[in-house]
Interface confidence: medium
């Protein structure tokens, strides 16, 4: 695969991952009440997120309440907020860096310096994934630890929410996408000139017959 194709694939994965991260950050389903006592008919389910908690009645009616005071929040929620928001903002910066370094754009002139820009974009996305992974794993660890803690009442036990799974999928996409972007700019130096005919007229890789694609030339 040419480095331009790797860049496109990497950028698409990073954008999807970024969207997933925003979704995970905003969803109130970081932890959900665990159904452990089957003798009790649970009339409501509690969801907790970084920004609000929601109570879902058995009737389907949902009521959400945004956390009033930042100071009243637990350390892990505050840290998770800071890290996930940082990751989302960093991914936004990484998008512009990656676009500047992409072979299909002309805002930065071609050449080794442009490769460094593209590589920086890929590394930023990798860092975004790692940054987001910290609160997700930390949060999950606390939920699991409390779930198995006998001193925690059954009514206060929670399970991992959908937002955590979305977040993990998002971080995976960000890191795989970041790796592909780095690959396009660094590892695949053997085929770094496979550019877009729309912008450039760099020769494509020789075909099976050993000739260049003549449509690149005017």
């Amino acid at each position: 695969m040419g480095s331009a194709a790797l860049e496109i694939l990497g950028l698409v994965l990073c954008l999807v991952g970024w969207g997933g991260l925003i979704l995970a950050c905003g969803l109130p389903m970081w932890q959900v009440t665990a159904f452990l006592d089957h003798n009790i008919v649970t009339a409501q389910t509690t969801w907790k997120g970084l920004w609000m908690s929601c109570v879902v009645q058995s009737t389907g009616h949902m009521q959400c309440k945004v956390y009033d005071s930042v100071l009243a929040l637990s350390t892990e929620v505050q840290a998770a907020r800071a890290l996930t928001v940082s990751a989302v903002l960093l991914a936004f910066v990484a998008l512009f860096v990656t676009l500047a370094g992409a072979q299909c754009t002309t805002c930065v002139a071609p050449g080794p310096a442009k490769a460094r820009v593209a590589l920086t974009g890929g590394v930023l996305y990798l860092f975004c994934g790692l940054l987001a992974l910290v609160p997700l794993c930390w949060f999950a660890n606390i939920v699991v630890r409390e779930f198995y803690d006998p001193s925690v009442p059954v009514s206060q036990k929670y399970e991992l929410g959908a937002a955590l799974y979305i977040g993990w999928a998002a971080t995976a996409l960000l890191m795989v996408g970041g790796c592909l972007l780095c690959c396009g700019a660094w590892v695949c130096t053997g085929r770094p000139d496979l550019s877009f005919p729309v912008k450039y007229s760099a020769p494509r890789r020789p075909t099976a017959t050993g000739d260049y694609d003549k449509k690149n030339y005017v």
Partner: antibody, heavy 119, light 106 residues
Framework: QVQLKESGPGLVQPSQTLSLTCTVS????????VSWIRQPPGKGLEWMGV???????EYNSTVKSRLSISRDTSKNQVFLKMNSLQTEDSAMFFC?????????????WGQGVMVTVSS | DIVLTQSPATLSVTPGESVSLSCRAS??????IHWYQQKSNESPRLLIR???QSISRIPSRFSGSGSGTDFTLTINGVESEDLSVYYC?????????FGSGTKLEI
Amino acid sequence: QVQLKESGPGLVQPSQTLSLTCTVSGLSLIRNSVSWIRQPPGKGLEWMGVIWSNGGTEYNSTVKSRLSISRDTSKNQVFLKMNSLQTEDSAMFFCARTPDGYYPYFDYWGQGVMVTVSS
Amino acid sequence: DIVLTQSPATLSVTPGESVSLSCRASQGISTSIHWYQQKSNESPRLLIRYASQSISRIPSRFSGSGSGTDFTLTINGVESEDLSVYYCQQSYNLPLTFGSGTKLEI
């Protein structure tokens, strides 16, 4: 068919300015980059600079202060201007097509023009 | 600047034999090396790009290898028309630089 052809004076006085033209055919300068490379008699090749497809330029630090590369996309021509020439600047000057990409090389070359700096 | 050292400076060969030309970079440059052939009173011609990628219209007897700092251009079965100077060029960093060349004598 891709062709590059250098043209300019064969003899330049010391301290004067050298002006060379590279006329490109078979390629559009809007989609292609062109480099200038020189070769003193009996010596090796030295990359002087490039004008990228987007119009940006990069120069070798050895000649940066004296060199200017420009182009006229309508005429498909690339120009080299180098001032304050000295006798050691005598060389064969080549222009070469440089594929856009992260790690450029030179796949089509002109036949070269010999420039002698002498009084 | 990245310095490319080519060795040997001159290489005497007999037609039909295989030869290897060396190019060493002053720092790691991945596979960002390209090889050129320059015959007497002619402009250089691209032989190999990115250390090992062959070029159309170039005879298959020319091949390249290497990565990092050490690179080799191999000519399998030298022909009399191969009498030339061979240059390596790096594109890992600007300024783009060339090796001093290896002269092949038949």
